[in-house]
């Protein structure tokens, strides 16, 4: 469930603190409820960037698990189509710390509406 997703995000945050990853990531910091699945997709795609750049087994495994969890939760809700949402590349670029904070916020949005 989404609580496990948050715990994975916390784990990624802890793992990243011991590294020096300068990447900036497309971040949706003001998610509209009607675009939350699209925003989630962008967050997950950017997480893969973190995983790739870190080259770290623990981060890789945690990112992969988080994506598996999110996939299964969202697929159980059926196909949700959203329109009029921003493309990932249109989002503001932020550092990893801000990115992860925004990610937690969107997950909490899913928790609150489930």
């Amino acid at each position: 469930n989404w609580v496990n997703v948050i715990s994975d995000l916390k784990k990624i945050e802890d793992l990243i603190q011991s590294m020096h990853i300068d990447a900036t990531l497309y971040t949706e910091s003001d998610v509209h409820p009607s675009c939350k699945v699209t925003a989630m997709k962008c967050f997950l795609l950017e997480l893969q960037v973190i995983s790739h750049e870190s080259g770290d087994t623990d981060i890789h495994d945690t990112v992969e698990n988080l994506i598996i969890l999110a996939n299964n939760i969202l697929s159980s809700n059926g196909n949700i189509t959203e329109s009029g949402c921003k493309e990932c590349e249109e989002l503001e670029e932020k550092n990893i710390k801000e990115f992860l904070q925004s990610f937690v916020h969107i997950v909490q949005m899913f928790i609150n509406t489930s």
């Epitope: 995983s51 890789h60 495994d61 598996i68 996939n71 969202l74 697929s75």
Partner: antibody
Framework: EVRLMASGGGLVQPGGSLRLSCAAS????????MSWVRQAPGKGLEWVAT????????YYPDTVKGRFTISRDNSKNTLYLQMNSLRAEDTAVYYC???????????????WGQGTLVTVSS | DVVMTQSPLSLPVTLGQPASISCRSS???????????LEWYQQRPGQSPRLLIY???NRFSGVPDRFSGSGSGTDFTLKISRVEAEDVGVYYC?????????FGQGTKLEIK
Amino acid sequence: EVRLMASGGGLVQPGGSLRLSCAASEFTFSNYAMSWVRQAPGKGLEWVATISRGGDYTYYPDTVKGRFTISRDNSKNTLYLQMNSLRAEDTAVYYCARRVSMITGGYAMDYWGQGTLVTVSS
Amino acid sequence: DVVMTQSPLSLPVTLGQPASISCRSSQSIVDITGNTYLEWYQQRPGQSPRLLIYKVFNRFSGVPDRFSGSGSGTDFTLKISRVEAEDVGVYYCFQDSFVPYTFGQGTKLEIK
């Protein structure tokens, strides 16, 4: 050439336990997730378990969840499948397979071991 | 759970002729990141399975180019442009977009 050697199969009574092993060589074991897949006699393939590269994350279908445990020892290049509370329907050839994970270009079980036969019967 | 349904279950083919196997999923297997994790495996008689195709249409290294994969969403196809004697065996589609990962029932290819 990637090598995977499954072992530990045999005859076991219903309710019994068995531990399968899969020895890996000719590749960096810790860089890959691993899976177990089984095939009942004359039947199709069934996914049984997957474990992440570091071993922290495991995945199972409901048919084996709570009875089977996948684990790994990266220092020994070995994958395990602990099977408890075995049933007649667990009778199958068990294959271990190396799993390419998404960050490295998509999911797939790209190399398979030769399989070890588990027979559950009284 | 995602159910994978293959057809036909038995496929008699003349050597040198094309063959086509269909695989249909009970729901879309496009994941949240837009990827479709659909593979095809070949199992020759008495052998372990072998990867042919991954992510719908990517041929694994060493796989002859007479094998090709296509499809999207819920409908997928494995094609063999000219069947050879060594192609005899059972072919399985497999999805690992969603847990639990699931195989199709298998299609047995035999020579007429």
